[in-house]
Interface confidence: low
Amino acid sequence: TSSASSSSSSAPFLASAASAQPPLPDQCPALCECSEAARTVKCVNRNLTEVPTDLPLYVRNLFLTGNQLAVLPAGAFARRPPLAELAALNLSGSRLDEVRGGAFEHLPSLRQLDLSHNPLAYLSPFAFSGSNASISAPSPLVELILNHIVPPDDKRQNRSFEGMVAAALVAGRALQGLHLLELASNHFLYLPRDVLAQLPSLRYLDLSNNSLVSLTYVSFRNLTHLESLHLEDNALKVLHNGTLAELQGLPHVRVFLDNNPWVCDCHMADMVTWLKQTGVVQGKDRLTCAFPEKMRNRVLLELNSADLDCDPILPPSLQTSYVFLGIVLALIGAIFLLVLYLNRKGIKKWMHNIRDACRDHMEGYHYRYEINADPRLTNLSSNSDV
């Protein structure tokens, strides 16, 4: 079976596909299992290195899991006639490390795409939008599943992985109809701030099992349809007032916060107050403190303001400032000592002069003291200019 998976553009692919015999409705590619009744094709765990070219036109659900596809080029699923019925595409665990721009073009009904468990060292910004236009044609995608797509450290590009994924999600505003986005288990340290603003239709967002420390710069404000927000198993320490207000303002949301290392000090007071009155957080009675040591395993809902104190330790921002100040002062001190050392002879001479001047000065004081002590010389002392 010929395949144009190595093609870097969909145009040559379409040409070759057009010249081949159009696939028969009932044919099934080698190494695949097909069910026309279920509109399903499964090419699972077959070590395929390319997407089969001869997929049947009836396919609605295509499973290409457990293969060795490596690269998904532009137009990887483009056919003539197109696979107009394809609605669900599962490519999980197929050792993909590169998804190029336009890889999912010419799939007009594609609603669900699963790229999970592929070590994506390169995800083109135009993987989902299909073009580099500032505003692309809307993608039909409703569900995008990108769990555990982080590559191993040695395969990572220099650029931030979070930034690479974010660029693909916002390109051309193509994913404005996305309802579900799963980004679990990707070692995310932060969420790029403009991503959610470009996904206004989200109902379900899964960011669980990442390394998110803070949501301070993330805005949920325009996710007015958001129904489930999964933040379990991250590194969240506290949610600040801005985030709390935004979550409370979403009319429909349920938030999942289990298994985060909550820091129960004075900065937690607002979050505890909010937790006690909100219906937004699912399983809020399970949330417990991780730090400081004396608060470990205390239930957040059972805390009151007296429990939430801060040791008289400088906050991290001030600590950083004072460390910097200390370094500057040390440098100034070192320069000062160096100057003293280089001018040691002059300083020695200067010191002698100072000593002599001081001696004369002190003798003057002694003289004045003696005059003041003798009542007979009082008038003289008042006129004296010592």
């Epitope: 609605r60 609605a87 609603r111 489930s228």
Partner: antibody, heavy 118, light 110 residues
Framework: QSVEESGGRLVTPGTPLTLTCTAS????????MGWVRQAPGKGLEWIGI?????STYYANWAKGRFAISKTSTTVDLKITSPATEDTATYFC???????????????WGQGTLVTVSS | AYDMTQTPASVSAAVGGTVTIKCQAS??????LAWYQQKPGQPPKLLIY???TLASGVSSRFKGSGSGTQFTLTIGDLESADAATYYC????????????FGGGTEVLVK
């Protein structure tokens, strides 16, 4: 917690009819509410839903033929121009949550019978 | 448009036996499927949601499985009270659908 339908009756074709679902023991702003109908001897037919914050969704065949709205305690289903094939028992049902996604009905009314006949 | 096809339309089994009902979605609905039981003159009752999660107060004799497009409801250790019509319902989307429910399966207990 309960829901109860009312307003079902015999109507002539083309005469608009409004069915009302009254909710007790819970807030309609926290749940998605749906209407489902069942023609005599037939299966269940999904008409549409209104979610916690008031957005409505209809089955393709129901668009334009039905309108769902709500107040703080009731959910209405208006049959804009009833036809004989709209004869059925109409059920009001509450979703498990306020979601429109991953939605299922865990609380049902007993239904109200609408008969459309000339 | 997310059509739900239930098979068989009717099934009969003896008390103590097992019944299996299948539901097929025309497109993948992940695990967002519910099963209901309806007896004559009564409203439907939720049995299972999210394909396999038992609703509150429902006997563990009812078991749901499947994901994507293929789903199964299995009723084990059949009792006469299980005689009813069973419906599947997709909860994946409320947009662009004709009927969220399957056509129903009548279970007769001998």
């Amino acid at each position: 917690q309960s829901v109860e339908e009312s307003g079902g009756r015999l109507v002539t074709p083309g005469t608009p009819l409004t069915l009302t679902c009254t909710a007790s023991g819970f807030s309609l702003s926290d749940y998605t509410m749906g209407w489902v109908r069942q023609a005599p001897g037939k299966g269940l037919e999904w008409i549409g839903i209104i979610n916690g914050y008031g957005s409505t969704y209809y089955a393709n065949w129901a668009k334009g033929r039905f309108a769902i709205s709500k107040t703080s305690t009731t959910v209405d289903l208006k049959i804009t121009s009833p036809a004989t094939e709209d004869t059925a028992t109409y059920f009001c049902a509450r979703g498990d949550t306020g979601r429109t996604y991953d939605m299922h009905f865990n609380l049902w009314g007993q239904g109200t019978l609408v008969t459309v006949s000339s | 448009a997310y059509d739900m096809t239930q098979t068989p339309a009717s099934v009969s089994a003896a008390v103590g036996g097992t019944v299996t009902i299948k539901c097929q979605a025309s497109e993948s609905i992940r695990s967002w499927l519910a099963w209901y039981q309806q007896k004559p003159g009564q409203p439907p009752k939720l049995l299972i949601y999210s394909a396999s999660t038992l609703a509150s107060g429902v006997s563990s004799r009812f078991k749901g499985s499947g994901s994507g497009t293929q789903f199964t409801l299995t009723i084990g250790d059949l009792e006469s009270a299980d005689a009813a019509t069973y419906y599947c319902q997709q909860g994946y989307t409320s947009s662009n659908l004709d009927n969220a429910f399957g056509g129903g399966t009548e279970v007769l207990v001998k």
